[in-house]
């Protein structure tokens, strides 16, 4: 059973490849199946196949197997690229070396050790014998190839074509002799697929019998092909997980190449005065840890016993007691001469890359692998492994653990706004990191907007001028007070959260602010029964350049007839042009005897391109902005309305689609307003609400 389940380990996989037969005489067998494993089982056992199966192709699109009596090295066959195909070739037929006694050898060597040509197995001339192909099914006694059907001591052999010499062994090297590695084999990409005790290696793309993190797609540069021995993690030499359920992993017997040289690509950049990257190439002579304690010699076992010896870690320059990074740690380190302190980092060695200036990310930074570990608010990032439970709480897939090393800024949840990290601070559980998008990177971080133009956008300044007084259900409208005066609008999106604008906070002292809810009059006149006055407990600034702030209330608002929340749009959604929307505010209204009542101005959605034309081409809108024009000339938002909402209705649902932020001018005829597009930041808002703790009512 186990043998059958694991037969795919006996095949070499070539992704996106198929075989096309040029010779029409070559046979093929096809059948619908679910997995490549099923194809492999049948190929290995030759069950129901009218030929000896040497390879197969799994068609992922059609869920179909194509079994072949040939492989890519056979004549009359050519390889072809195809997205939906994966080619699997039985390793025994393409190997030029033997494992152990060579019982499984199915290569094409047909000359003996002394150079005599082999006699075909099906022939009785010049030597009669009982090794007929029909008697040794599965042993591939084809042509006159060297074989070892009984697993005898000397390895593969054949009857010879010389009448004087009945049989002789063939000179086929052991795979462990052919295969060699440099240093500790981190760059080894050979075909050794069994351990030093002879156990077959588990495929890297399989999770049975042993679950592991080294998935080929996660580590495309580690050479995780098929089930070949590799050294992805700085071990003394290559290893693999085994097919033995009781032996998780074992080293492989791969000898060191005679000419122990490395390709340039294998070598980290060598430096002597400073650290490049994680300092794996540091070859300087600093020999104390950061606080001055001297290092222990690498070839010594006192005071600390260890296996980081120069013998185990060749090419890592473990000379004397110099700081080194042989194992892919954060930076160079050493064992110390203090019996109470086993290891320490040599963090006093300066960084060669003296600046964060080069640190940038592309797209949304999901592939960012830099080593910045501080948030934009100056907090040190906390280790990812301590926060996996929290991460699983807000993402619905398995995060790529290979990228989540140490406490470096990363983007495991596909956040549209770049790398971030957890902080360990309960008030600010996570925050973005101060990394910018790479210069010239125009990858859209969101793809389904109307006509996104990636550029440096400019926003239109608007205020509710000449609006109509309103008293309809606008319970989500918030008056943000600064030192007892109205300063900005805001939208209650959750009982404890108000969405508003960055520009509304001239002071950092939260005691300077209050949120007034349930009011119609900016001074609260006549609103005593419905007014709720709440203190502000925290400001959460939006992603860089967003102009948004989520304001956390000191206690949750009580939802009633006068106070309600407003819905958020779906992330990345677009709303059709000409949709009727409204902006609300208590700001400057253009009237001399301003009565202080909440005003509404009716606008309609305008596409970004048309909007730009109305601004005489001076404004290019990007994916984070939304445009709305006034139905009434000179009507729109103004100072004191900043932070307030652009509210639109779709499918009988009202939602906050935009936030009013400062820009240029005020209610200028034919100049539509430009707002922060809430849909672009909806995931950020949900993430904050989900991860930041709020007081219970």
């Amino acid at each position: 059973q186990r043998k059958r389940r694991n037969t795919i380990h006996e095949f070499k996989k070539s992704a996106k490849t198929t075989l096309i037969k040029i010779d029409p005489a070559l046979k093929i067998k096809t059948k619908k199946v679910n997995t490549a494993d099923q194809c492999a089982n049948r190929c290995t056992r030759n069950k129901g196949l009218p030929f000896t199966c040497k390879a197969f192709v799994f068609d992922k699109a059609r869920k179909q197997c194509l079994w072949f009596p040939f492989n890519s090295m056979s004549s009359g066959v050519k390889k072809e690229f195809g997205h939906e195909f994966d080619l699997y070739e039985n390793k025994d037929y393409i190997r030029n070396c033997i494992i152990g006694k060579g019982r499984s050898y199915k290569g094409t060597v047909s000359i003996t050790k002394s150079g005599i040509k082999c006699q075909p197995w099906s022939s009785m001339i010049p030597h009669e014998h009982s090794f007929l192909p029909s008697s040794y099914r599965g042993k591939d006694l084809q042509e006159n190839y060297c074989r070892n059907p009984r697993g005898e001591e000397g390895g593969p052999w054949c009857f010879t074509s010389n009448p004087e010499v009945r049989y002789e062994v063939c000179d086929i090297p052991q795979c462990s002799e052919v295969e060699c590695m440099t240093c500790n084999g981190e760059s080894y990409r050979g075909l050794m697929d069994h351990t030093e005790s002879g156990k077959i290696c588990q495929r890297w793309d399989h999770q049975t019998p042993h679950r592991h993190k080294f998935l080929p797609e996660r580590y495309p540069d580690k050479g995780f092909d098929d089930n070949y021995c590799r050294n992805p993690d700085g071990q003394p030499r290559p290893w693999c997980y085994t097919l033995d359920p009781h032996t998780r992993w074992e080293y492989c017997a791969i000898k060191t190449c005679a000419d122990n040289t490395m390709n340039d690509t294998d070598v980290p950049l060598e430096t002597t005065e400073c650290i490049q990257g994680q300092g794996e190439g540091y070859r300087g002579t600093v020999n104390t840890i950061w606080n001055g304690i001297p290092c222990q010699r690498w070839d010594s076992q006192y005071p600390h016993e260890h296996d980081m010896t120069p013998e185990n870690f060749k090419c890592k320059d473990l000379r004397e007691n110099y700081c080194r990074n042989p194992d892919g740690s954060e930076s160079p380190w050493c064992f110390t001469t203090d019996p109470n302190i086993r290891v320490g980092y040599c963090s006093q060695i300066p960084n060669c890359d003296m600046s964060h200036g080069q640190d940038c990310y592309r797209g949304n930074g999901k592939n960012y692998m830099g080593n910045l570990s501080q948030t934009r608010s100056g907090l040190t990032c906390s280790m990812w492994d301590k926060n996996m439970e929290d991460l699983h709480r807000h993402i619905f897939w398995e995060p790529d653990a290979s990228k989540l090393n140490e406490n470096y800024c990363r983007n495991p949840d596909d956040d549209a706004h770049g790398p971030w990290c957890y902080t360990g601070n309960p008030l600010i559980p996570w925050d973005y990191c101060p990394i910018s998008r790479c210069e010239g990177d125009t990858t859209p971080t969101i793809v389904n907007l109307d006509h996104p133009v990636i550029s440096c956008a400019k926003t239109k300044q608007l205020r509710v001028v000449n609006g109509i007084p309103t008293r309809t259900n606008i319970g989500w409208m918030v008056s943000l007070r600064y030192r007892n005066k109205h300063i900005c609008g805001g939208s209650l999106i959750k009982e404890s959260w108000v969405l508003t604008a960055r520009q509304c906070f001239p002071s950092r002292d939260l005691k300077d602010y209050e949120a007034w809810l349930g009011i119609h009059d900016v001074h609260g006149r006549g609103d005593e029964k419905c007014k709720q006055v709440l203190n502000v407990s925290q400001l959460v600034y939006g992603p860089e350049g967003s102009d948004l702030v989520l304001m956390k209330l000191a206690r949750p608002a009580v939802l009633d007839d006068f106070v309600s929340t407003i819905d958020l749009p779906n992330y990345g959604c677009t709303i059709p042009e000409k949709t009727s929307c409204s902006v609300y505010g208590w700001g400057y209204t253009g009237l001399i005897n301003y009565d202080g009542l909440l005003r509404v101005a009716h606008l309609y959605i305008m596409g970004n391109e048309k909007c730009s034309q109305h601004h005489r081409g001076k404004v290019t809108l990007n994916e984070s902005e939304i445009c709305a024009g006034a139905e009434k000339i000179g009507s729109g938002p103004c100072e004191g309305d900043y932070g307030g909402p652009l509210v639109c209705e779709q499918h009988k649902m009202r939602m906050v689609l935009g936030v009013i932020v400062p820009g240029r001018g005020c209610a200028i005829p034919n100049r539509p307003g430009i707002f922060v597009r809430v849909a672009y930041y909806a995931k950020w808002i949900h993430k904050i609400i989900l991860t930041y703790k709020v007081p219970q009512s």
């Epitope: 100056g378 520009q503 001239p506």
Partner: antibody, heavy 119, light 110 residues
Framework: EVQLVESGGGLVQPGGSLRLSCAAS????????MSWVRQAPGKGLEWIGI????????DYASSAKGRFTISRDNSKNTLYLQMNSLRAEDTAVYYC????????????WGQGTLVTVSS | DIQMTQSPSSLSASVGDRVTITCQAS??????LAWYQQKPGKVPKLLIY???TLASGVPSRFSGSGSGTDFTLTISSLQPEDVATYYC????????????FGGGTKVEIK
């Protein structure tokens, strides 16, 4: 390119007035808090005041209160510092600066313009 | 109102030395503190914001720490190009402020 360029500096007599301009390019001044900072010859940086992006009045250092006024013209993307009742101790290089981040630091500075108050 | 006090007003150190400058606020300003570098005849340049976050393009030998009222700017290994005057600035509140900046620290090479 994001930059600020000051102009309007020069020699002025004590008691006189001067208006400094700060033209922005590459960003919209209306979206940011903007500050004026000065530096007397051989002395340190002195904060003059800040203009906000909403209806709140600008804030000034006590040395500038009542004599200096910060304003802006969003249509011209320009910041201004109107200086009245100038004194000899107002002699300095005047810088305008954009207030970035969470409105808490000056990330872009102009090259400065020299104002000399002397009879 | 918030006052910023910087010390020392000047210092002289050798190339490779570790240099520390301190800044004290008269009341808590959380981490809303920035550090600027001004070389002779040049415009001030932002080094560190939010007390410890390195601004873009700034060498990693510069670091900042502190919160509340006490802050520190450290140059781990002084270089000749670091000769300049360094200023701290609070960004906590702008009302009733005499000067948002500290008095400055002039750094020279011995």
């Amino acid at each position: 390119e994001v930059q600020l360029v000051e102009s309007g500096g020069g020699l002025v007599q004590p008691g006189g007035s001067l208006r400094l301009s700060c033209a922005a390019s590459g960003f919209t001044v209306g979206r940011y808090y903007m500050s004026w900072v000065r530096q007397a010859p051989g002395k340190g940086l002195e904060w003059i005041g800040i203009i906000y992006t909403h209806g709140v009045n600008p804030d000034y250092a006590s040395s500038a209160k009542g004599r200096f006024t910060i304003s802006r013209d969003n249509s011209k993307n320009t910041l201004y510092l109107q200086m009245n009742s100038l004194r000899a101790e107002d002699t300095a290089v005047y810088y305008c600066a954009r207030v970035g981040g969470f409105n808490d630091y000056s990330d872009i500075w102009g090259q400065g313009t020299l104002v000399t108050v002397s009879s | 109102d918030i006052q910023m006090t910087q010390s020392p007003s000047s210092l002289s150190a050798s190339v490779g030395d570790r240099v520390t400058i301190t800044c004290q606020a008269s009341e808590s300003i959380s981490t809303y503190l920035a550090w600027y570098q001004q070389k002779p005849g040049k415009v001030p340049k932002l080094l560190i914001y939010r007390a410890s976050t390195l601004a873009s393009g700034v060498p990693s030998r510069f670091s900042g720490s502190g919160s509340g009222t006490d802050f520190t700017l450290t140059i781990s290994s002084l270089q000749p190009e670091d000769v300049a005057t360094y200023y701290c600035q609070q960004g906590y509140s702008y009302s009733n402020v005499d000067n948002a900046f500290g008095g400055g620290t002039k750094v020279e090479i011995k």
